[in-house]
């Protein structure tokens, strides 16, 4: 992957509306030295999404792809 | 190591223009989109404008449509935002940022590498 470890991602917006489950292949969270908290979706197409880790579609996402 | 570094801001009067430059190095350039965020004192940060580095899209924020518009240059590893018809309310530090791979979510995009910004001012 070209994004090294070496590097500290955060957010700084949050995707207004759910993105299709169907796309999404796997999920990260942002490192707790970032101002705001989000989980990183990850789609099919190696797009990287901030999304808002209080919504109840998200934890919802996540636990389907710890389920799958 | 990574390197954006921004150039451009100043001073000016209502109705004038500038262009900001961005100057990246140390990762590859055409992994990431370049984007231009803003952030005026007491205010949260807005994503204002993108460009995929590998297909050139684009992306602004509905406040600077018609008025800012960003290319690249990738021979030059440098993207340029260019501001027109500037109002005191585009007063703000500017900060560059890359973000993986395109322009499609952004600003919901994680910001892998920051600039450290060039201030804006807009006189009226």
């Known amino acids: 992957s070209p994004y090294s470890s070496d590097t500290t991602p955060c957010c700084f917006a949050y995707i207004a509306r759910p993105l299709p489950r169907a796309h999404i292949k796997e999920y990260f969270y942002t490192s707790g030295k970032c101002s705001n908290p989000a989980v990183v979706f990850v789609t099919r197409k190696n797009r990287q999404v901030c999304a808002n880790p209080e919504k109840k579609w998200v934890r919802e996402y996540i636990n389907s792809l710890e389920m799958s | 190591e990574v390197q954006l570094v921004e150039s451009g801001g100043g001073l000016v009067q209502a109705g004038g223009s500038l262009r900001l430059s961005c100057a990246a190095s140390?990762?590859?350039?055409?992994?990431?989109?370049i984007g231009w965020f803003r952030q005026a004192p007491g205010k949260e940060r807005e994503g204002v404008s993108c460009?995929?580095?590998?297909?050139?899209?684009?992306y602004s924020a509905d406040s600077v449509k018609g008025r800012f518009t960003i290319s690249s240059d990738n021979a030059k590893n440098t993207v340029y935002l260019q501001m027109n018809n500037l109002n005191p309310e585009d007063t703000a530090a500017y900060y560059c940022?890359?973000?993986?791979?395109?322009?499609?979510?952004?600003?919901?995009?994680?910001?892998?590498?920051w600039g450290q910004g060039t201030q804006v001012t807009v006189s009226s």
């Open positions: 140390g990762f590859n350039f055409d992994d990431y989109a």
């Open positions: 460009i995929s580095s590998s297909d050139g899209s684009t």
């Open positions: 940022a890359a973000a993986p791979p395109d322009c499609t979510y952004y600003p919901a995009t994680p910001i892998y590498y």
